[in-house]
């Protein structure tokens, strides 16, 4: 069991923006508003980010560190999915994505990581101390869930400093101690602030976002040394319980996709979707829902009137090619 504060690795500044410090000016508040406490498993990482532009808007990013075939990802808030949590989104690798307010956009980032943007206004909007959980169902690894949240004091000045250390796999958890990483981050942050102080105030420009190729295992937490905590989740008591959502599967059994028409199963392949992420061949246990049942010993799902899906053209294994032997 591990507990870690996870912040993203800083990207090197873009050369063109270095002079005006535009990139760093944008990165700094974003980084300061990023803090995540993940507990429960070394196999799943969760990152909760409060947007610097909209302080009531959240981005949740989750990833699975196993190498098996992911069959479902469930994002919930207010606690783990099966223990009082309310489902925000369900992402199925072949049958698409289902989301519920206040979830604004759920999508696959890589074949083993997802992101979810939460709407920031209204009665059901999240608040700083809400706990978000991600559950990955994979074979042969099983179901793995981890939870994260912004601390109640999500004031930019109080957030943990970033760690510029490279992304680490969970297995290498003991290499860097938390103190060392935080110290390094503090020094780096002070260095940035100092440089910022000695420069003329830059003119604000509209941020230009360059689409980044999805990286497998991106944003994996650089973990703290293994804590001997035998607590399944670090659930922070939240004073702002989410409003009741229109969940089609309130008991955690995602039956909404069990009755989908088969034509809804394949997601359209976006232009050059996943071209930058080579999809590894999977073993015989992979079950791509239409056409490859024999390899996984799977039966086709029942057809019938299904729910409307929001297919994600950037699906991780949309129309996967021939399967290799693991």
């Amino acid at each position: 069991m591990r507990t870690e504060a996870q912040v993203p690795a800083l990207q090197p500044p873009e050369p063109g923006l270095e002079g005006a410090m535009g990139h760093r000016t944008l990165v700094l508040p974003w980084v300061l508003l990023t803090l995540c406490v993940t507990a429960g498993t070394p196999e799943v990482w969760v990152q909760v980010r409060m947007e610097a532009t909209e302080l009531s808007s959240f981005t949740i990013r989750c990833g699975f560190l196993g190498s098996g075939s992911i069959s479902l990802v469930t994002v919930s808030w207010g606690g783990p999915n099966g223990a009082g949590g309310t489902t925000l989104a369900v992402l199925h690798p072949e049958r698409g994505i289902r989301q519920w307010a206040p979830a604004r956009q759920a999508r696959w980032e890589t074949q083993s990581s997802i992101s979810l943007i939460l709407e920031g206004s209204g009665a059901s909007s999240p608040c700083a101390n809400t706990t978000f959980c991600c559950k990955f169902a994979s074979f042969p690894e099983g179901s793995w869930e981890a939870c994260g949240s912004l601390p109640p004091s999500s004031d930019p000045g109080l957030s943990a400093p970033p760690t510029p250390a490279p992304i680490l796999r969970a297995d290498l958890a003991g290499i860097l101690g938390v103190s060392g990483v935080l110290l390094f981050g503090c020094v780096y942050l002070l260095h940035l602030l100092r440089r910022h102080k000695h420069r003329p105030a830059p003119r604000l420009q509209p941020s230009r976002t360059s689409p980044q190729a999805p990286r497998a295992r991106a944003w994996a937490p650089s973990q703290a040394s293994q804590a001997a905590l035998h607590v399944p989740y670090a659930t922070i008591n939240t004073s702002c319980r989410p409003a009741t959502l229109d969940t089609a599967h309130p008991h955690g059994g995602p039956s909404w996709w069990a009755s989908l028409p088969t034509h809804a199963a394949h997601r359209p392949q976006g232009p050059a979707a996943w071209a930058s992420t080579p999809i590894p061949a999977r073993g015989s246990f992979v079950s791509v829902e239409n056409g490859l049942y024999a390899q996984a010993g799977e039966r086709p799902p029942h057809t019938g009137p299904g729910l409307t899906l929001f297919p994600d053209p950037r699906g991780p294994r949309a129309m996967e090619g021939p399967l290799g032997v693991r």
């Epitope: 069959s71 099966g82 059994g253 039956s255």
Partner: antibody, heavy 119, light 108 residues
């Protein structure tokens, strides 16, 4: 309290068929993956098959693929294992198991049902 | 297929004695997907230690688990009569899911 109760075992001739059932209670059945694990007379444990909570994902051991079919009825809280073309090597106690998040596939076990394949 | 080899196959220990049994995997297994089960005669197996070192609910603290890669072990710091049972190791890092043949622990 999680309860898994297997039934349907018995004596069957080689080449014959048998359908095992597992009645579950004490938890939200539709929210968990279920498996069949068997224990041979030599006391070896062998994984047979697994079915995801929704029921559309199924996984089999190589030895059983094509002969066995795992299925579930979420409305009735029942898990099934349809076995055909049975061999003497299939003689075992068959256990129904339930998974748990962050704990693996076989967190909870039923009491088992004995299947004997013999002429 | 990951083959799990448990040793010894049978062992006996006196009350209060420290007991260690091992499980060796034919290829590397992530510690998260490695577990131990306890089975007593006439009963079903029970999850005993999950993810290498975490004790399942109701397991006495005299039990501990450790290991990584291809080598794992279960230790009882002080043998008690109720610990006499067969212990199986299990991995679900790779398909098919496999179990060791078991270590039968008897009370001397």
């Amino acid at each position: 309290e999680v309860q898994l109760v297997e039934s349907g075992g018995g004596l069957v001739k080689p080449g014959g068929s048998l359908k095992l059932s597992c009645a579950a209670s004490g938890f939200t059945f539709s929210g968990y993956a279920l498996s069949w694990v068997r224990q041979t007379p030599e006391k070896r444990l062998e994984w047979v098959a697994t079915i995801r909570d929704g029921g559309s994902y199924t996984y089999y051991s190589d030895n059983e693929k094509g002969r066995f079919t795992i299925s579930r009825d979420n409305a009735k809280n029942n898990l099934y294992l349809q076995m055909s073309h049975l061999k003497s090597e299939d003689t075992a106690i068959y256990y129904c198991t339930r998974d748990q998040v962050n704990r693996g596939w076989f967190t909870y076990w039923g009491q088992g049902t004995l299947v004997t394949v013999s002429a | 297929q990951v083959i799990l080899t448990q040793s010894p196959a049978i062992m006996s220990a006196s009350l209060g004695e420290r007991v260690t049994m091992t499980c060796s995997a034919s290829s590397s297994v992530s510690s998260s997907y490695f577990h131990w089960f306890q089975q007593k005669p006439g009963s079903s197996p029970k999850l005993w230690i999950y993810s290498t070192s975490n004790l399942a609910s109701g397991v006495p603290p005299r039990f501990s688990g450790s290991g990584s890669g291809t080598s794992y072990s279960l230790t009882i710091s002080s043998m008690e009569a109720e610990d006499a049972a067969t212990y199986y190791c299990h991995q679900h890092h790779r398909s098919p899911l496999t179990f060791g043949a078991g270590t039968k622990l008897e009370l001397k």
